[in-house]
Structures are given as C-alpha cells and as structure tokens.
C-alpha cells in the first residue's frame, strides 16, 4: 500500500466505502506543507482537501468522504504549485472495513454463538478469535455472515473473545486492511467476566549442567 | 467454459471508425461482478488496455483514448462492442476481447480472445 | 500512468533452465501484479495473480513473488511449450498496465 515518488511515501485507506484517507511521509520535503488535489471523475477539475492530517504542525494526509458509486481515485500531492506525486488508483484495493458493531454472545451448552449487524456491502469475512488462559494463541473462526459458532468449548473455562470484519481476497485483492478488532469480551460459564487469567505461558527447559 | 471471439472487418480506411464485436460463449455477460475489456497489441510492441464495460453497463476508458472509444453490449446476444473513431494508422494492431478475473474489481484477465489484426490504411 | 518495465527484453535458454524473469512497477502496487504468456498464435493466458498466486490448471513449475515495485517470474525447468512471450501487469492503478514483454527462444 505503500507508494513511492520522489521521496514520498503513500498510504491510502478506503474505510468502510466512506472514507478515503490518504497519508504520506515527505522525507524529501521536511517543513514543507504540501497540497492534496483529488477528484473521483477523470472528467472533474480538482478539489483541494478540507480535512488535511497534521503532524509536528505540517500536513501529512488528507481525509476525503467517498460514496460507494465512487472507485477510482485521481490525486496529486503538490508542493506549492510543483506535483510530486500524481496518481490513480482503485480505492477498493485499500478497504478498511468498520469493527463489528452491536456485538452479542448467546450460549448454549458447549458452543457460542456470536453475532453483529452486517456491514452494508458484500464480500466480507467475519472473524471471531477465542482462547482461553490455557491456549498461547488465539484460536480462529470464520463466516461470511457475522453469525458465527464457536463449538467445543468448555463450560468451566473462562474464555476471551474479540471479533474483526476482513474483505474477502476474491473480491477486493490481497492488500486491504481487516478492521480493528472488536472490545475483548470475556465469558465463563455463559456469563461475562470483567477477565480471564493471562495465558499460561509454558515453563523454560532448565538447562542440566 | 468460457469463450470470447472478436470479428469484424480487418482493413479500416483512415478517418473512419474501426467497428468491432467479441461473442463471449459459455458465460453471460451480465453475471454479477464481471468486466469486459478491449485490449490491443501494437506490432512488434505489447499489449495496451483500451477499456471496460461492467455487468452494469458500467464503462472506463483508457485515458489516451477516450476521447474516441465507445464500448457498449447486447445482452441478448450475449456480445459487447467497440468502436473506435477517426482512426490513424497508430491504430493498426491485433484487437483482443478479455473478461477481468475478479468481478467487481477489475483485476487480472483471465480469458482472452484469439484477437483480430485490424489495418488502418487507405 | 503506472509504467511497468521488464527484464530482459528477450532471452534465450534450453530445455530444463530455470528461467527467470523481473518486472518493475514505477510505483508500489502492493502485491496487485499478475502474468501472462502469450505464444504465437494463441490467446494470451494467465499464469499467476496477485504476484504469487497459481492458476488452476498452470504447471507447478511457474511461480512468482515479490511486492511493491520488484516482481519475479520463475520457470524452474524449461520446457518445449514454455518458449513464448511473458507480460507482466498492474491493476490497482488506474489504467491497467503491461510490461513490454519478454521473449523467452530456444537457445
């Protein structure tokens, strides 16, 4: 995702077919406050962004709404009147999509089953990870809906849950972004925990002299 | 199995419009996701993307050529179309059909058609 | 437009040589690159998506990797069909774009 142009470093982000964000690390141009120019139609003039990202006092990125209709971006990073990078890209490739929203568990003997709203737009993946103090990694599984079961598990253990929403490879390519993850969201015997005990991480072999 | 087969006339005269047809067999052109392009090779040189139309109609056209790139389909026939204006002999290629991998998202192609020489000279 | 530069132009080998080929992006493309080989007379065919991702139905010898800019096409034993044109092209950038070529001979 990373763009390079004269010393320039891109980063582009399309979260949840809203929002564009386009960031860049001049380290040709230190103290300087470049310009962002984008457009979503080849046929457009420009527009100079509103929302620009500072950092140390100088623009760094440039926050722009998009709608779902709109797939190819058209932008220029300027330093005063001079582009030093000009570029088009398929915003699609750099989805980020939103964290799981009105999360909720429901258990039933050894197995829970967890569920979200749906995101608006297809070719998602959503991913819950489960583990429990006794597992060093957090164990994975996945739907195309956000309804997924996790079974086998054990009623007594107390066990940690977070959950993220992917873009599908098959639909958006290999470069997007899964969302953030969900709150971590702790459960023991159908009911919730304010935590579960750190996993137990396994003894070092004592070396024998 | 999907098949894509241009025809049309291979000896266009300067000025004129270059008029081409692919006949995709085996797939329809209105599956959902899907994207059809024009692509054509130069002699001797590589290949050059021209354009697509989507299962929703939808077009993009090279930037260096839209200005005289037209692509539209007959669903009915199961055909999309390409016409290109006030051709030069610049224009003068082998013209291939292509259907993009991944629908909705124009990736690579993963079909092509046999490709059709067209001449440009009077 | 994303200039895509290959290398070499041409390259003459024998059967059962691993044969490599690169390909360069004038701006980073992420993983978005895929190849084609293209024998006379033919359609062109895909070999590899998304850089290192196989067809179903391509030999095994065909692999590719890399990311960003630098992207390699590997043939790891020549064979008889494999004598033909390869191109290399991005897609995230807008338009799509291909490499000039490279025209693998028998040596």
């Known amino acids: 995702q990373v763009a390079t142009g004269e010393g320039l470093q891109i980063q582009i982000m399309y979260f949840n077919l809203e929002t564009v964000q386009v960031t860049w690390n001049a380290s040709h141009y230190p103290r300087s406050n470049l310009s962002f120019h984008y457009k979503f139609s080849r046929d457009e003039a420009y527009d100079q962004c509103t929302v620009y990202i500072l950092q140390e006092g100088h623009t760094s990125g440039c926050l722009l709404d998009a709608e779902q209709q709109d797939d190819i971006l058209y932008f220029s990073i300027r330093n005063g009147t001079h582009p030093v990078f000009t570029a088009s890209r398929w915003i699609f490739y750099y989805l980020k999509p939103s964290s799981p929203k009105q999360v909720s568990f429901s258990w039933h003997q050894d197995a829970v089953t967890l569920t979200c709203s749906d995101l608006s737009y297809r070719g998602l993946l959503y991913e819950v990870q489960y583990r429990s103090p006794f597992d060093t990694e957090w164990q994975s599984k996945q739907e195309n809906t956000c309804n997924v079961t996790v079974e086998d598990l054990d009623a007594e253990k107390c066990y940690a849950f977070r959950a993220r929403v992917k873009a599908m490879e098959d639909a958006y390519g290999p470069d997007t972004y899964p969302s953030d993850w969900s709150e971590v969201t702790c459960w023991q015997r159908g009911e919730t925990r304010d935590s579960c005990p750190e996993p137990r991480t396994p003894p070092k072999p004592k070396l024998s002299k | 199995q999907v098949q894509l087969q241009e025809s049309g006339p291979g000896l266009v005269k300067p000025s004129q419009t270059l008029s081409l047809t692919c006949t995709v067999s085996g797939f329809s052109i209105t599956t959902s996701g899907y994207y059809w392009s024009w692509i054509r090779q130069h002699p001797g040189k590589g290949l050059e993307w021209i354009g697509y139309?989507?299962?929703?109609?939808?077009?993009y056209y090279s930037p260096s050529l839209k200005s005289r790139v037209t692509i539209s389909r007959d669903t009915s026939k199961n055909q999309f179309s390409l016409k290109l204006s006030s051709v030069t002999a610049a224009d003068t290629a082998v013209y291939y059909c292509?259907?993009?991998?991944?629908?909705?998202?124009?990736?690579?192609?993963?079909?092509w058609g046999q490709g059709t020489l067209v001449t440009v000279s009077s | 437009d994303i200039q895509m530069t290959q290398s070499p132009s041409s390259l003459s080998a024998s059967v059962g040589d691993r044969v490599t080929i690169t390909c360069r992006a004038s701006?980073?493309?992420?993983?978005?690159l895929h190849w084609y080989q293209h024998r006379p007379g033919e359609t062109p065919k895909l070999l590899i998506k998304f850089a290192s991702r196989s067809i179903s139905g391509v030999p095994s010898r065909f692999s590719g990797s890399g990311s960003g800019t630098d992207f390699t096409l590997t043939i790891s034993s020549l064979q008889p069909e494999d004598f033909a044109t390869y191109y290399c092209?991005?897609?995230?950038?807008?338009?799509?774009?291909f490499g000039q070529g490279t025209k693998l001979e028998i040596k």
């Open positions: 292509a259907r993009s991998l991944y629908g909705g998202y124009k990736d690579a192609f993963d079909s």
């Open positions: 139309i989507g299962y929703n109609s939808k077009t």
């Open positions: 092209q991005q897609s995230p950038g807008f338009p799509p774009t």
């Open positions: 701006q980073s493309i992420g993983t978005s």
